[in-house]
């Protein structure tokens, strides 16, 4: 079965800079899975942001600002990366990755 690890326990960024969050997949080939990213703001319910499927298709939640989030995966390191552009107060949250095994 697949296993996920987010090596960065926390990430501190200056306003307007770019943040990159990593999710390392083990126990399964990343190319055979879909990786989902969610965020949980303080005091709010968890919210789906973006996913990248086994065939590379990216799906974004409607209502999420365009250009704010980018998702990628690197088969060589079995890693999915969530990039957050122009970091703002509204982006302060705990970010989770999740796996869907095809």
């Amino acid at each position: 079965a697949g296993h996920l690890e987010q090596p960065q326990i926390s990430s501190t960024k200056t306003l307007s800079k770019t943040a990159r969050l990593e999710c390392v997949v083990s126990g399964i080939t990343i190319s055979a899975t879909s990786v989902y990213w969610y965020r949980e703001r303080p005091g709010e319910v968890i919210q789906f942001l973006v996913s990248i499927s086994y065939d590379g298709t990216v799906r974004k939640e409607s209502g999420i600002p365009s250009g704010k989030f980018e998702v990628d995966r690197i088969p060589e390191t079995s890693t999915s990366t969530l990039t957050i552009h122009n970091v703002e107060k509204q982006d302060i949250a705990t970010y989770y990755c999740a796996l869907w095994e095809v």
């Epitope: 306003l15 307007s16 703001r41 303080p42 005091g43 709010e44 600002p65 250009g67 704010k68 122009n86 703002e88 107060k89 509204q90 302060i92």
Partner: antibody
């Protein structure tokens, strides 16, 4: 001195347009979320719109959605509110207000409008 | 949308007395997103309390905030002459982001 100064108010006929401006000084404008809040004569406060520091997140009250547009120019320390299709019920003093910003303590994510302008009066009447 | 209900509408108290103002939300509000303001005639509002219980810069310690969930309270321990004003609670949420209560007018008895 931290300051917000609104301008652009005035008398306009129903269906008309106005553009409000808010000039910010005394702080790093690009680091703060900004808001417009209005107050009709003798009434309470009504939040109108907000815009995040890099303009990614923009929200409107249902009462103005589709008619008002908020924007900002971080290079000019300026907040704008374009108001179209104005109605009599839009008559109010319009304040711009700054959100608390990001602190480095445990309350870093708390919200609250900590700096307000004195407001500009908008009157919609035929 | 979350509706914020403030009570009482008007509160008449004498200087030196304790004032207790209530704010009730129509659904749960994280204390992170609850603020209180004071407004005097002809002036812009002033932030008193954010995060339900944290005093804003320069606010005297006779002002305190408490509460969680749907019930929040602003307390003024000993009323001073300059405290007579209208007080508003406000929540930050996701749809729409900000909503204010209708206010409590604190007047001299």
């Amino acid at each position: 001195e931290v300051q917000l100064v609104e301008s652009g108010g005035g008398l306009v006929k129903p269906g008309g347009s106005l553009r409000l401006s808010c000039a910010a000084s005394g702080f790093t404008f690009s680091h703060y979320d900004m808001n417009w809040v209005r107050q009709a004569p003798g009434k309470g406060l009504e939040w109108v719109s907000s815009i995040s520091s890099s303009s990614s997140y923009i929200f409107y009250a249902d009462s103005v959605k589709g008619r008002f547009t908020i924007s900002r120019d971080n290079a000019k320390n300026s907040l704008l509110l374009q108001m179209n299709s104005l109605r009599a019920e839009d008559t109010a003093v319009y304040h711009c207000a700054r959100d608390r910003g990001v602190g480095d303590t445990s309350d870093y994510y708390s919200f609250g409008l900590d700096v307000w302008g004195q407001g500009t009066m908008v009157t919609v009447s035929s | 949308d979350i509706v914020m209900t403030q009570s009482p509408g008007t509160l008449s108290l004498s200087p030196g007395e304790r004032a207790t103002l209530s704010c009730r939300a129509s659904q749960n509000v994280s204390s992170t997103y609850l603020a209180w303001y004071q407004q005097k005639p002809g002036q812009a509002p002033r932030l008193l309390i954010y995060g339900a219980c944290s005093r804003a810069t320069g606010i005297p310690d006779r002002f305190s905030g408490s509460g969680s969930g749907t019930d929040f309270t602003l307390t003024i321990s000993r009323l001073e002459p300059e405290d007579y004003a209208v007080y508003y609670c406000q929540q930050y949420g996701s749809s729409p982001p900000y909503t204010f209560g209708r206010g409590t007018k604190l007047e001299i008895k």
